[in-house]
Amino acid sequence: QRLPRMQEDSPLGGGSSGEDDPLGEEDLPSEEDSPREEDPPGEEDLPGEEDLPGEEDLPEVKPKSEEEGSLKLEDLPTVEAPGDPQEPQNNAHRDKEGDDQSHWRYGGDPPWPRVSPACAGRFQSPVDIRPQLAAFCPALRPLELLGFQLPPLPELRLRNNGHSVQLTLPPGLEMALGPGREYRALQLHLHWGAAGRPGSEHTVEGHRFPAEIHVVHLSTAFARVDEALGRPGGLAVLAAFLEEGPEENSAYEQLLSRLEEIAEEGSETQVPGLDISALLPSDFSRYFQYEGSLTTPPCAQGVIWTVFNQTVMLSAKQLHTLSDTLWGPGDSRLQLNFRATQPLNGRVIEASFPAGVDSSPRAAEPVQLNSCLAAGD
């Protein structure tokens, strides 16, 4: 049984996405804009001594000999997203000793490329998704998740790392993007905005959603995150948009109800194991996929992004709790922790379903659809 959560099943950018509201400045697509140095770095901040790389904090990278088969959340880079170009972030300031990549913030100095040169790469994340331009790839099969329904014990670590809230996942959560494309989940974290301001990292036709969840995975071809960073397909992130619905989402409440305990930057608590798949959309067959990067320094490329077409619904109160409870460094609220969208630079976003055909209410005129590349090869 799945907990009721996501009602929206129209293509992204449709119906309940809030398209009737005029988009704010920060909702405008910036995919065509060249990356700005002041944009907050990606969504994975590199592991320092204690913090792993970006997409929030990747589990700490441990020597292979130590607990060889056991991946830790710390082994993944922590990647955080910078705010919109128009609104530099004042939170998620990293000032701890250790790797240089731990010294970064959203929307201010130092410029991310100075923190990590990869942040100036050509194939960065997040991006603006335009369903009409996506290439339909029938070879993209439904995602397969195994072992995501965790028992209450052992408990899991929930941490405010200063740029997101991150849940460290235990060994045994397996995910397949397709035959021979197998991964292990390491951690999940969220990106959000502020009161009345959306904070998803990816956008759809320029529309920014209230929040976004990222589940970070390591390819089974690699034993450690540091080996996989920058390697094509070494890391994979499942991303889903969160938006407002009429009911409380009981799966998310198991995490959101604990945020007060970790309001202070660097604090952590333990939470009962839960059904991680219940935090994601129920439709694993309809998604967009492209190759990008961590959304926070080190901004390592080669990351396979899978963005669900279906959204997850949280109540207004839950979204408020998410955006208004945590504190970052320097007595600043942890808000607007997203990176500006980055240019595609010729990349083609693939879709597992015919997203470009009569699917987006925002489509104004017919466009030339991209052809599907050799997906799954």
């Epitope: 907990l3 028992p151 209450p152 014990l153 009981s250 198991q254 333990q270 939470v271």
Partner: antibody, heavy 124, light 107 residues
């Protein structure tokens, strides 16, 4: 044989304090989550607090009804569990049970060993 | 908090009967449910864990079933020593919550 023996109950005035103890034996104390559960006369059971095992850092967790007033702790060397109860109210009157919970190999919380209980009466 | 709705609150049955006690939970708890027996003047004792697993030393006439939000405890071939109050308890997340109890009496 696994044994849990509570002590420290008694009559106390509203606003007063008590410290309950639970002497344990027959198992590896540090491996287990330990709980306090109470039962007012003729009423249902109510979980109050637990303290995690060594692997989880001996951190506590409380129910909303006692958070800020009660403190759970453990003396690992003497294998004793404690419940410090402050600002007691008449509605805290109950039999208090020391209970063994999950351990490193458990996959959820159930209460497999219970002490005989100690009675707390809060009255003026 | 997860709410536990136990029914009936009391029931009377004859020796040798089969009786069923229900526990409805306010949200999906998978199989993370336990059943306890508390005889008059005694402490609670674990009967069933993980919805259907019999605890050590518990007679096989006690069986548990269910998952998600609906659970049942069945006692077959009722015996005099089964006179007690029975409680369900969720172990999915804290605060851990118990049902209000079902008092079983012999006719």
């Amino acid at each position: 044989e696994v044994k849990l023996v509570e002590s420290g109950g008694g009559l106390v005035q509203p606003g007063g304090s008590l410290r309950l103890s639970c002497a344990t034996s027959g198992f590896t104390f540090t491996d287990y989550y330990m709980h306090w559960v109470r039962q007012p006369p003729g009423m249902a059971l109510e979980w109050l607090a637990f303290i995690r095992n060594k692997a989880s850092g001996y951190t506590p967790q409380y129910s909303a009804s006692v958070k800020g007033r009660f403190t759970i702790s453990r003396d690992v060397s003497q294998t004793i569990l404690y419940l410090q109860m402050n600002t007691l109210r008449p509605e805290d009157s109950a039999t208090y049970y020391c209970v063994r919970g999950g351990h490193a190999g458990s996959n959820y919380w159930y209460f497999d060993v219970w002490g005989a209980g100690t009675t707390v009466t809060v009255s003026s | 908090d997860i709410q536990m709705n136990q029914s009936p609150s009391s029931l009377s049955a004859s020796l040798g009967d089969t009786i069923t006690i229900a526990c409805h939970v306010s949200q999906n708890i998978n199989v993370w449910l336990s059943w306890y027996q508390q005889k008059p003047g005694n402490i609670p004792k674990l009967l069933i864990y993980q919805a259907s697993n019999l605890h050590t030393g518990v007679p096989s006439r006690f069986t548990g079933s269910g998952s998600g939000t609906g659970f049942t405890l069945t006692i077959s071939s009722l015996q005099p020593e089964d006179i007690a109050t029975y409680y369900c308890q969720q172990g999915q997340s804290y605060p851990f919550t118990f049902g209000s109890g079902t008092k079983l009496e012999i006719k």
